[in-house]
């Protein structure tokens, strides 16, 4: 069981306290109410690329 804040989720996912696991941020546009989507807003998605060096 992961303690929040100890092991970060992989890029493009966020921790869900309601499900006790990392969840894919890609599902958030379809269902923004999910608790983990708050964390997705603070982190860039997996496909995000910086436009500057």
């Amino acid at each position: 069981e992961r303690v929040p804040g100890t092991t970060p989720c992989s890029r493009g996912s966020s921790w869900s306290a309601d499900l006790d696991k990392c969840m894919d941020c890609a599902s958030c546009p379809a269902r923004p109410h999910s608790d983990f989507c708050l964390g997705c807003a603070a982190a860039p998605p997996a496909s995000f690329r910086l436009l500057w060096p």
Epitope: A17, D18, L19, D20, A30, R31, H33, S34
Partner: antibody, heavy 120, light 108 residues
């Protein structure tokens, strides 16, 4: 075979307390979110409460918030619902149900229910 | 809160009939809609999840369709064991879920 068995229902006076239990068997209990749903006599289904697999996250319907407490003991494969300050409108059959294995989109196994009657 | 409205509230049908029950959400819930069957004195049983996926062990005469706000449960050929009450349930706002008021399918 997956089984959920509720117990603890009965007749209680308004303002009283009751603790419901839901004993799980036939599957590994700890990874699954669980809920309580109730059904008043002759009425439809009403969601009551949710608990995450670890028990660290809980949610309640507005109608029971501040009076009911959901909890679980994963070492005992048991889900609980502590019901305080009971009202006549809490009279219902209470069901526990298991959430889906990837999300809590659906509830695939339900107990047989336990009847709670609040009356003086 | 999202309200779920089923229609009709009850219906009478004969064995072999095609039966359709509708469920309407007060706002779009995408495809996050489940259907349950409940017989008197028994617990609800999951039939369809995520609008159109048939739960394991459920006969293929049951099917679900729809997305957004309008959903349908269809029983292609009603069997004696299908006389029951059917509930829709939205999981778009999970874990804060809501059920429809139910549709009772009775024998004509």
């Amino acid at each position: 075979e997956v089984q959920l068995l509720e117990s603890g229902g009965g007749l209680v006076q308004p303002g009283g307390s009751l603790r419901l239990s839901c004993a799980a068997s036939g599957f590994t209990f700890s990874p699954y979110p669980m809920i309580w749903v109730r059904q008043a006599p002759g009425k439809g289904l009403e969601w009551v409460s949710y608990i995450s697999p670890s028990g660290g996250s809980t949610h309640y319907a507005d109608s029971v918030k501040g009076r009911f407490t959901i909890s679980r003991d994963n070492s005992k494969n048991t889900l609980y619902l502590q019901m305080n300050s009971l009202r006549a409108e809490d009279t219902a059959v209470y069901y526990c149900a298991r959430g889906g294995d990837t999300y809590f989109d659906y509830f695939d196994y339900w107990g047989q229910g336990t009847l709670v009657t609040v009356s003086s | 809160d999202i309200q779920m409205t089923q229609s009709p509230s009850s219906l009478s049908a004969s064995v072999g009939d095609r039966v359709t029950i509708t469920c309407r959400a007060s706002q779009s819930i995408s495809g996050y809609l489940n259907w349950y069957q409940q017989k008197p004195g028994k617990a609800p049983k999951l039939l369809i999840y995520q609008a159109s996926s048939l739960q394991s062990g459920v006969p293929s005469r049951f099917s679900g369709s729809g997305s957004g706000t309008d959903f349908t449960l269809t029983i292609s050929s009603l069997q004696p064991e299908d006389f029951a009450t059917y509930y829709c349930q939205q999981s778009y706002t999970s874990p804060f879920i809501t059920f429809g008021q139910g549709t009772k399918v009775e024998i004509k």
